[in-house]
C-alpha cells in the first residue's frame, strides 16, 4: 500500500486512509502504538482503504503502520505519524454567583496540560481573557456586572496543542432574578409562596413557562411536573399528550417531557416524590434527575436515592417514556397498555403514579412499590424537581 | 474483564464461623449490589443475602437472618460473608454474583464458588 | 416468599430440537423473572432478563415469554452445548427465589 495518511483526528479517534497495493492482497494489517500506550494490531481485508482508529488517548503522537498480505508473502511496511487532539476539560461550572463574583470550576482533562485558557463574556460584549496554571481547576471571577448573563468558555492548552472550548452561561445577581430559569430562581428573588410562577428556560424571557412552584418542601424551590390527588384528570394519554403536558396546574397535571428536558437540560437537577396516604406521608429524594430529548424518546437518568419511601424510581433508571401509542419499553407486551398509563416502562414497573386513580388492582393504580406496593394506590403523589445545588445558593442568599 | 474470585471456604465444624470473601475487578464496584448464592450439593439455587453498591442496605434469606453478615469494602473492591453458628444444613457451594445495574436483583457475572462444609 | 415452580423438571431431547420450559410464579411478578443455564461444575449463567431480553452474547435460538404468573423459556433448535439445567429466578421481591430447575440431557 502507499499515501497513508490519517484524518479526522479528535481526541480520540481518527481514521486511516491508504491507497491500495496494486496487486490483490488478502489482508492489510494495521498497528498503531503512542508513547506509554501498548501497540494495538489489527487485520482488515484487502479490498479496505480505510480504517478508523478508536479509543485513542488525547495529546499524544501516536505511529501508524501498514502492510499488506498475501498468502504468506508481506509487502513494505509504510508508516505515518499523527498526534491525537488535546481533550476537553469537563464540568465547567459557575457556582457561588454573587451580584459581582462567581467562582468558575471544572474537571481537568484526562491528557496533561501546561495551562488553561478561560474566556468570559457579558452579552454586551464585554470580553475577558485570564490564562491559568496546570494544576488549577477553579478560578474566581471578580468585578463582574451585576444582573448579566455571562458565558465562560475554558480551553486546555498543551504547549502549542489546543482542546475544544466547553462552556457554561449564568447570570449574576441583582436583587432579583429578572428571568427565573426554575423555582429555586423564584425563590431566591424572594417568592416563598407555592402557587403558580413563570420561569425563564435557560433564563429567555421568549421561553416563559407557568408551573407550580412548591416552595415548602425540604426547603421550597421545587418545580412540580406532576401531582395526583383526586382522579379528576384522566392520565392514560397517547405521546403527544406526554411531551405537551396537560392538566390544571394547580389541581391534578402533567407538566410535559419536553418542558421537563428543556429544563433538567438547564444544569443538575434533583427529584423529590412526595406520597401520602391515609394520614401516612413518605418521600424519596435522587440527587441526579435528567429527563433525555425527543430523540431518545425522554431516556430518565434518576441516581443518588435517599428517603423513607423505598429506591423504587432505580428500576427505571436508563429507561424511555412510554405510552399506550409508542411502545418503548424492554417488555413483549405494552406496559402502558396493560397497566392503562405512561411511565419510563421497563417490564414493567416499580412505579406507576401515571396509573389508574384508586385502582388497587395489581400494577394498575397509583403505585410506588417500596413504599404500598402493586396492590394499593396511594391517594397523593407530587414529583417535583430544583437544582441540586439549591442547598449552597439558599445559603448563601440567607448570607448575602 | 469482569472477574469474581471468592475464596474463604472449607470444612469446618456445626456451631463454628468461617467469614467469605469475594474480590471483584473489571467493573465499577461500588455501581452495583453485589450477592451470595449458594448450591447444596446436587441441588438448586437458593439466593442467601445481597447488599446495596453504598453498603447502606443488606438483605438476607430467612434461613440465615441473625447468623450471617453480608458487608462490603468498595475502597478494595471486596465482598465479604461473615457466616457464624454453622449448620449442616449450610453446607453448599457459596457464589458471589454481580447485580445489574438499577436494582440489582438480576445476577449478571457469578464467580466459580467457594466449598463451604459443615460436618463434626 | 415468592415459589417458583418449573416444569418439566427434566427433558431428553435431540440436537435440533424445539425445547420449551415452563415457569409458574406462586403470586403476580410482572415481567421481574431470569432465566439461567447451569453446565455441571460451572457457575449460572444469565440468559434471559426481564422475561424477554436477551442477556448479551446469548445465541439468537434462546428466547422467553410470559409475564405476570407463567413465563416460558424456549430453545429453537437445541445444539449440543445447550445440554445443562436451566432455572428461572423472580426479582419482584426480597428473598429473590429460583425455580428447582431443570435438566435438560440428550435423548
Known amino acids: 500500500p502507499s499515501g497513508l495518511v490519517t484524518a479526522n483526528i479528535t481526541d480520540s479517534e481518527a481514521l486511516a486512509r491508504w491507497q491500495p497495493a496494486i496487486a490483490t492482497v488478502d489482508s492489510y494489517v494495521i498497528s498503531y502504538t503512542g508513547e506509554k500506550v501498548p501497540e494495538i494490531t489489527r487485520t482488515v481485508s484487502g479490498n479496505t482503504v480505510e480504517y478508523a482508529l478508536t479509543d485513542l488517548e488525547p495529546a499524544t503522537e501516536y505511529t501508524l503502520r501498514i502492510f499488506a498480505e498475501k498468502g504468506p508473502q508481506k509487502s513494505s511496511t509504510i508508516t505515518a505519524k499523527f498526534t491525537t487532539d488535546l481533550d476537553s476539560p469537563r464540568d465547567l461550572t459557575a457556582t457561588e454567583v454573587q451580584s459581582e463574583t462567581a467562582l468558575l470550576t471544572w474537571r481537568p482533562p484526562r491528557a496533561s496540560v501546561t495551562g488553561y485558557l478561560l474566556v468570559y463574556e457579558s452579552v454586551d460584549g464585554t470580553v475577558k481573557e485570564v490564562i491559568v496554571g496546570p494544576d488549577t481547576t477553579s478560578y474566581s471571577l471578580a468585578d463582574l456586572s451585576p444582573s448579566t448573563h455571562y458565558t465562560a468558555k475554558i480551553q486546555a492548552l498543551n504547549g502549542p496543542l489546543r482542546s475544544n472550548m466547553i462552556q457554561t452561561i449564568f447570570t449574576t445577581i441583582g436583587l432579583l432574578y429578572p428571568f427565573p430559569k426554575d423555582c429555586s430562581q423564584a425563590m431566591l428573588n424572594g417568592d416563598t409562596t407555592s402557587g403558580l410562577y413563570t420561569i425563564y428556560l435557560n433564563g429567555d424571557k421568549a421561553e416563559a413557562l407557568e408551573v407550580f412552584c412548591d416552595m415548602t418542601s425540604d426547603g421550597g424551590g421545587w418545580i412540580v411536573f406532576l401531582r395526583r390527588k383526586n382522579g379528576r384528570e384522566n392520565f392514560y394519554q397517547n405521546w403527544k399528550a406526554y411531551a405537551a403536558g396537560f392538566g390544571d396546574r394547580r389541581e391534578e397535571f402533567w407538566l410535559g417531557l419536553d418542558n421537563l428536558n428543556k429544563i433538567t437540560a438547564q444544569g443538575q437537577y434533583e427529584l423529590r416524590v412526595d406520597l401520602r396516604d391515609h394520614g401516612e406521608t413518605a418521600f424519596a429524594v435522587y440527587d441526579k434527575f435528567s429527563v433525555g430529548d425527543a430523540k431518545t424518546r425522554y431516556k430518565l437518568k434518576v441516581e443518588g436515592y435517599s428517603g423513607t419511601a423505598g429506591d423504587s424510581m432505580a428500576y427505571h433508571n436508563g429507561r424511555s417514556f412510554s405510552t399506550f401509542d409508542k411502545d418503548t419499553d424492554s417488555a413483549i407486551t405494552n406496559c402502558a397498555l396493560s397497566y392503562k398509563g405512561a411511565f419510563w416502562y421497563r417490564n414493567c414497573h416499580r412505579v406507576n403514579l401515571m396509573g389508574r386513580y384508586g385502582d388497587n388492582n395489581h400494577s394498575q393504580g397509583v403505585n410506588w412499590f417500596h413504599w404500598k406496593g402493586h396492590e394499593h394506590s396511594i391517594q397523593f403523589a407530587e414529583m417535583k424537581l430544583r437544582p441540586s445545588n439549591f442547598r449552597n445558593l439558599e445559603g448563601r442568599r440567607k448570607r448575602a | 474483564q469482569v472477574q469474581l474470585v471468592e475464596s474463604g471456604g472449607g470444612l469446618v465444624q456445626p456451631g463454628r464461623s468461617l467469614r467469605l470473601s469475594c474480590a471483584a475487578s473489571?467493573?465499577?464496584?461500588?455501581?452495583?449490589?453485589m450477592h451470595w448464592v449458594r448450591q447444596a450439593p446436587g441441588k438448586g439455587l437458593e439466593w442467601v443475602s445481597g447488599i446495596s453498591g453504598s453498603g447502606g442496605s443488606t438483605y438476607y434469606a430467612d434461613s440465615v437472618k441473625g447468623r450471617f453478615t453480608i458487608s462490603r469494602d468498595n475502597a478494595k473492591n471486596s465482598l465479604y460473608l461473615q457466616m457464624n453458628s454453622l449448620r449442616a444444613e449450610d453446607t453448599a457451594l457459596y457464589y458471589c454474583a454481580k447485580g445489574t445495574r438499577g436494582e440489582g436483583d438480576t445476577f449478571d457475572i457469578w464467580g466459580q464458588g467457594t466449598m463451604v462444609t459443615v460436618s463434626s | 416468599d415468592i415459589q417458583m415452580t418449573q416444569s418439566p423438571s427434566s427433558l431428553s431431547a435431540s440436537v435440533g430440537d424445539r425445547v420449551t420450559i415452563t415457569c409458574r410464579a406462586s403470586q403476580y411478578i410482572q415481567g421481574f423473572l431470569n432465566w439461567y443455564q447451569q453446565k455441571p461444575g460451572k457457575a449460572p449463567k444469565l440468559l434471559i432478563y426481564d422475561a424477554s431480553n436477551l442477556e448479551t452474547g446469548v445465541p439468537s435460538r434462546f428466547s422467553g415469554s410470559g409475564s405476570g404468573t407463567d413465563f416460558t423459556l424456549t430453545i429453537s433448535s437445541l445444539q449440543p452445548e445447550d445440554f445443562a439445567t436451566y432455572y428461572c429466578q423472580q426479582s419482584y421481591s426480597t428473598p429473590q427465589t429460583f425455580g428447582q430447575g431443570t435438566k435438560v440431557d440428550i435423548k
Open positions: 473489571g467493573f465499577t464496584f461500588d455501581d452495583y449490589a
